[in-house]
Interface confidence: low
Amino acid sequence: DVERTTCPPEKEVHEIDESLIFYKKRELEACVDAALLAAQMDRVDAIPFTYEQLDVLKHKLDELYPQGYPESVIRHLGHLFLKMSPEDIRKWNVTSLETLKALLKVSKGHEMSAQVATLIDRVVVGRGQLDKDTVDTLTAFCPGCLCSLSPERLSSVPPSVIGAVRPQDLDTCGPRQLDVLYPKARLAFQNMSGSEYFVKIRPFLGGAPTEDVKALSQQNVSMDLATFMKLRREAVLPLTVAEVQKLLGPHVEGLKVEEQHSPVRDWILKQRQDDLDTLGLGLQGGIPNGYLILDLSVREALS
């Protein structure tokens, strides 16, 4: 903590300017008026403050705004944003995309994923939903940041906005997030022709149920292995060997490379070995011929 001292008269601060880089921490604490700092936040970024000096400036703002900074201050935080914790950011109410852009630019190249995720969350809350302008801003200034949102927040995305999402924006999305986004994408792209539909829906398929994957296998889509490997395990396990062969088309040979990895490994264990042999890939681990398959999960559910 910064010790409190009285400001020497010759050090009184009337403007936020370059002279402050020569102030020691305790001089900044004693001489900078928090209200003046808040009013002239836009100047802070042009001044090469040290991390220690930024700590003092943050402390000033925290004292002035214990309930959270107003957006007029947040917009001009600049590199002071690097000092903010997720707990600080949770107190904010942010509605302006200009504010979001400014802070996303600042965070670039710094390890701030938790802070950025919290900031985006506050923007979505502040704006009421994840609208097209917000998605456009995220895809332009923070590829992958869409996936930092919780499934609950993502549920506020209108299907009409899904078209603005690019494949690379979904790279870091987990199954629960794709579970939310997939039905929206299905709705958004439902009027497209088969091949065009597949191109659009492919990045979202990690959230697709078995019946939709089965339907795709009837459409000659030739799914690539990378997409197949991202499918939900639960969606892949019920597929027959014939369905997987039709789904992957010429890419079916890739199953050999992935045979030790989920979901391929789990799928192999559920297939009859003689069915697997029809692929001619030498996949091993299927159910030997002549064995009876009991679905114990059904029996347990009935007992």
């Epitope: 403007e15 300017d17 042009a46 001044i47 090469p48």
Partner: antibody
Framework: EVQLVQSGAEVKKPGASVKVSCKAS????????MHWVRQAPGQGLEWMGN????????YYNERFMSRVTMTVDKSTSTAYMELSSLRSEDTAVYYC??????????WGPGTLVTVSS | DIVMTQSPDSLAVSLGERATINCKSS????????????LAWYQQKPGQSPKLLIY???TRESGVPDRFSGSGSGTDFTLTISSLQAEDVAVYYC?????????FGGGTKVEIK
């Protein structure tokens, strides 16, 4: 429009002092640092120091520390640079320049100071 | 003090051609907090005061033609004039505005070939 108007050319004898003025207009004088830079004939630029017109705080290049004094008159929005114990190698054009954020965004026309016996 | 070294001392370029001026600092000008490089470029035409072109190494001052661009980071910086015009004949200076005393490079004279 930002304008910096400097005082006229001076001829001084070695050992004397010179005081160059720089009158600012078109912006809030106390909001920006004023820097002083000099340029000897046919030579490059040399930063002498700067002054915060709001507080009067100044920072000098150590090369001039014992001989230079920078002051301001807020009432007339004028900055002054006084250089004492002049020698022939101080012959130069002296510029005032307003900061834009540590860089020098606006420059005065310069004042030629000639030191000659 | 931070020493600024410019190269070349002079440069003759045909009209419409590219001119490249280099500037090297003895210490990094990259501020680890802001990720800004505290380097400016100035143009001084014969008989005139210097004029600011670029600050933060690559930010063009308003009103400066976009044929002027700055690049570089840390200790190595470049000013590029993409298509030299007659009115670009001048001496160009780099300056570090990171640590006092703020220091300038020795200047590069750009002429028409």
């Amino acid at each position: 429009e930002v304008q910096l108007v400097q005082s006229g050319a001076e001829v001084k004898k070695p050992g004397a002092s010179v005081k160059v003025s720089c009158k600012a207009s078109g912006y809030t004088f106390t909001n920006y640092w004023m820097h002083w830079v000099r340029q000897a004939p046919g030579q490059g630029l040399e930063w002498m120091g700067n002054i915060n017109p709001s507080s009067g705080d100044s920072y000098y290049n150590e090369r001039f520390m014992s001989r230079v004094t920078m002051t301001v008159d807020k009432s007339t929005s004028t900055a002054y640079m006084e250089l004492s114990s002049l020698r022939s190698e101080d012959t130069a054009v002296y510029y005032c320049a307003r900061s834009g954020g540590l860089w020098l965004a606006f420059w005065g026309p310069g004042t030629l100071v000639t030191v000659s016996s | 003090d931070i020493v600024m070294t410019q190269s070349p001392d002079s440069l003759a370029v045909s009209l419409g051609e590219r001119a490249t001026i280099n500037c090297k600092s003895s210490q990094t000008l990259l501020n680890s907090v802001s990720q800004n490089n505290y380097l400016a470029w100035y143009q001084q035409k014969p008989g005139q005061s210097p004029k600011l072109l670029i600050y933060f190494a690559s930010t063009r001052e308003s009103g400066v033609p976009d044929r002027f661009s700055g690049s570089g980071s840390g200790t190595d910086f470049t000013l590029t004039i993409s298509s030299l015009q007659a009115e670009d004949v001048a001496v160009y200076y780099c300056q570090q505005h990171y640590r006092t005393p703020y220091t300038f490079g020795g200047g590069t004279k750009v002429e028409i070939k």
